[in-house]
């Protein structure tokens, strides 16, 4: 028996359902009584879901997995994972045994988009050219961790005096805070771009300093 899975990682958004595709080619006369199907976490060998002795043995993994019972006889051994969490991310191995056995691993990549950045300025009043200001760009509830890029009004990257920190919340999603320290010119725009590397999603925030008032 030959097992086939997707070469590319399956990308799933947090809280959505994902299908980890796995298939085999049944011989003529194949019946489900002959099938042993096991899904497990590749690294820890933890059992996720199984079908043995002619019946679905159910989920061994947080009760959020399901097979496609009507399609098994056609060789579809795919696994449905419901309400995906950050902790579900990783490699899953599909084992199929009929007379002989084969296995293959598929990677699940979890993602969550970042919020539109909020911008704060310190100090935020009585600003003069030549003042040192701290601009903070904050974006929330994304996954995996973000890359943050700063640019000035002319699109020139600002790389010095930038400190970026990540904080994972109880769901494993990241809040990102990036701080730019810059000496003010006569006026100027400072932009931060928060990029989710998996989704290739860019979230933009900017602050324009033109004397008073400030524009966000």
């Amino acid at each position: 028996v030959e097992v086939q899975v997707s070469e590319d990682p399956v990308v799933a958004l947090v809280d959505t359902d994902a299908t980890l595709r796995c298939s085999f080619s049944p011989e003529p006369g194949f019946s489900l009584a002959q099938l042993n199907l096991i899904w497990q976490l590749t690294d820890t060998k933890q059992l996720v879901h199984s079908f043995t002795e002619g019946r679905d043995q159910g989920s061994a993994y947080s009760n959020r997995t399901a097979l496609f019972p009507d399609l098994l006889v056609q060789g579809n051994a795919s696994l449905r994972l419901q309400r995906v969490r950050v902790t579900d991310e990783g490699s899953y191995t599909c084992f199929v045994s009929i007379q002989d056995f084969d296995s293959a691993a598929v990677s699940l990549q979890v993602a969550a988009p970042y919020s539109k950045p909020s911008m704060t300025l310190e100090p935020n009043k009585d600003l003069r050219p030549g003042n040192m200001v701290t601009i903070t760009c904050s974006s929330y509830q994304g996954y995996p961790e973000a890359e943050v890029f700063w640019k000035d009004g002319q699109g020139v990257p600002l790389t010095g005096n930038v400190t970026t920190s990540q904080m994972a919340n109880e769901r494993g999603l990241f809040d990102v805070h990036s701080v730019l320290r810059v000496v003010l010119g006569a006026n100027g725009t400072y932009s931060c771009l928060v990029r989710n590397p998996v989704l290739q999603q860019d979230a933009h925030g900017s602050v324009t300093i033109t004397g008073q008032p400030l524009t966000f």
Epitope: D43, T87, S107, Y143, E147, M167, A168
Partner: antibody
Framework: DVQLVESGGGVVRPGESLRLSCAAS????????MNWVRQAPGEGLEWVSR?????????YYADSVKGRFTISRDNSKNTLYLQMNSLRAEDTAVYYC?????????????WGLGTLVTVSS | EIVLTQSPGTLSLSPGERATLSCRAS??????LAWYQQKPGQAPRLLIY???SRATGIPARFSGSGSGTEFTLTISSLQSGDFAVYYC??????????FGGGTKVEIK
């Protein structure tokens, strides 16, 4: 079994360079963030650098090494690297390769045995 | 940067006694704290993560508790192999990922 094996340590003079390697096995290397942690003789543990998983190459450094050290990984070779330039006496330490428990939980569930870097004139 | 302060610096106890090690964070880190054991000449070993979850293969005599800024590692009955240095580490906000200065548990 998970194994992390560091190599590349040695004795160098201040200002010189060294490249450390960490060969990983027993887990899906590309799925995990990886780190370097060091320990100066008789001192505590100090996190040095982290690189996130897959091929995204998002990297982080301790202030003490920023601009001098570069972390990288080759997922096809299951290997983590640390390029150390402009070495100083205070970089003398045992350097450990450590695997993050997950991409969002940066505790270190597996460690290598370490490789000693000595910077001395 | 989150600073972790471990106390005491050294704990002198006899086998069979109970060891209580403290780790205090300079700001709240929820439960994002790990504990490690390190014996001389060896790499650190993960004992506890998530403040209270035992790592794979760690005996039940090791337990962790606390959240926010105050954390405790308890060894219920010290065995000869438990005399070592113990470090706490936070992973709530980074970089940097920070360690405490360590507590040495030695034989009295």
């Amino acid at each position: 079994d998970v194994q992390l094996v560091e190599s590349g340590g040695g004795v160098v003079r201040p200002g010189e360079s060294l490249r450390l390697s960490c060969a990983a096995s027993g887990f899906t290397f590309s799925n995990y963030a990886m780190n370097w942690v060091r320990q100066a003789p008789g001192e505590g543990l100090e996190w040095v650098s982290r690189i996130n998983y897959k091929g995204y190459n998002i990297t982080y450094y301790a202030d003490s090494v920023k601009g001098r050290f570069t972390i990288s990984r080759d997922n096809s070779k299951n290997t983590l690297y640390l390029q150390m330039n402009s070495l100083r006496a205070e970089d003398t330490a045992v350097y450990y390769c450590a695997k993050s428990g997950s991409n969002s939980n940066n505790f270190f569930d597996y460690w290598g045995l370490g490789t000693l870097v000595t910077v001395s004139s | 940067e989150i600073v972790l302060t471990q106390s005491p610096g050294t704990l002198s106890l006899s086998p069979g006694e109970r060891a209580t090690l403290s780790c205090r964070a300079s700001q709240s880190i929820r439960s994002d704290l790990a504990w490690y054991q390190q014996k001389p000449g060896q790499a650190p070993r993960l004992l506890i993560y998530g403040a209270a979850s035992r790592a794979t293969g760690i005996p039940a005599r090791f337990s962790g508790s606390g959240s926010g800024t105050e954390f405790t590692l308890t060894i219920s009955s010290l065995q000869s192999g438990d005399f070592a240095v113990y470090y706490c580490q936070q992973y709530n906000s980074w970089p940097p990922l920070t360690f405490g200065g360590g507590t040495k548990v030695e034989i009295k």
